[in-house]
């Protein structure tokens, strides 16, 4: 990603509010000017900043990928919040994409956890109760999963 072409869009437009930095920092929703004298507001829906900062450019808003739903839009002080669509999940160790949840557990196992936006269905052995960590079941039973609702921000 090259920011070169984005830089002009993130400079101060006439309608953008300006204020003076406090101890060299600008408040959330702003970035500092090139000469360090002014705080310039981020552009709603385009970029944002979440903390007091001396950033020369506001952070670009995340755009939800296909396969994701937007739970809340990007504001000048908060990034977009994206969530995997129903029936898909995002693991912590592979946050770049939503993966399809399994439709059921392998034979000899029972489902103890539903598909949520951040986890696959959870299966355990009927007898031992130990979790199944395999990616793809050898044989699937017709055990359906119901999607969860809680949200998780995507970066």
């Amino acid at each position: 990603i090259t920011q070169q072409d984005l830089a002009p869009q993130q400079r101060a437009a006439p309608q953008q509010k300006r204020s003076s930095p406090s101890e060299g920092l600008c408040p959330p929703g702003h970035h500092i000017s090139e000469d360090g004298r002014d705080c310039i507001s981020c552009k709603y829906g385009q970029d944002y900043s979440t903390h007091w900062n001396d950033l020369l450019f506001c952070l670009r808003c995340t755009r939800c990928d296909s396969g994701e739903v937007e739970l809340s839009p990007c504001t000048t002080t908060r990034n977009t919040v994206c969530q995997c669509e129903e029936g898909t999940f995002r693991e912590e160790d592979s946050p770049e994409m939503c993966r399809k949840c399994r439709t059921g557990c392998p034979r000899g196992m029972v489902k103890v956890g539903d598909c949520t936006p951040w986890s696959d269905i959870e299966c355990v052995h009927k007898e031992s109760g130990t979790k199944h960590s395999g990616e793809v079941p050898a044989v699937e039973e017709t055990v359906t999963s119901s999607p969860g609702t809680p949200a998780s921000p995507c970066s």
Epitope: I1, I32, N53, L56, F57, L59, R60, T62, S155
Partner: nanobody, 128 residues
């Protein structure tokens, strides 16, 4: 502790070109996010350009966009600023700087005004 040494400044006529260099030592150059700032006589420090450690993220001030080009050669531990179509208002001491507390978001580098490691500067004078 990283140390920076700028060179390449001098007197040039309006419309002319200069190439500034910044040699870095004392640190792993390829891990440094860096920038160029300038200070005109009697004025404050002004951001000119910045580049991420990989060279993938590049930024320019409006006043130099289309005329200046920042680049780096990690194998030579050197940062460059190619300045074309120079104007009288580009006259300033140019400083190379390191952003030792860089901001990354979504894998993208965002430069700060308060870069905290500086060279001694090189004077660029644009005059006929």
């Amino acid at each position: 502790e990283v140390q920076l040494l700028e060179s390449g400044g001098g007197l040039v006529q309006p419309g002319g070109s200069l190439r500034l260099s910044c040699a870095a030592s004392g640190s792993t150059f390829s891990s440094l996010d860096m920038g160029w700032f300038r200070q005109a006589p009697g004025k404050g420090r002004e951001f000119v350009s910045a580049i991420s450690r990989s060279g993938d993220n590049i930024y320019y001030a409006d006043s130099v966009k289309g005329r200046f080009t920042i680049s780096r050669d990690n194998s030579k531990n050197t940062l460059y600023l190619q300045m074309n179509s120079l104007r009288a208002e580009d006259t300033a001491v140019y400083y190379c700087a390191v952003d030792s507390q860089p901001t990354y978001s979504g894998g993208v580098y965002y430069p700060r005004y308060g870069m905290d490691v500086w060279g001694q500067g090189t004077l660029v004078t644009v005059s006929s």
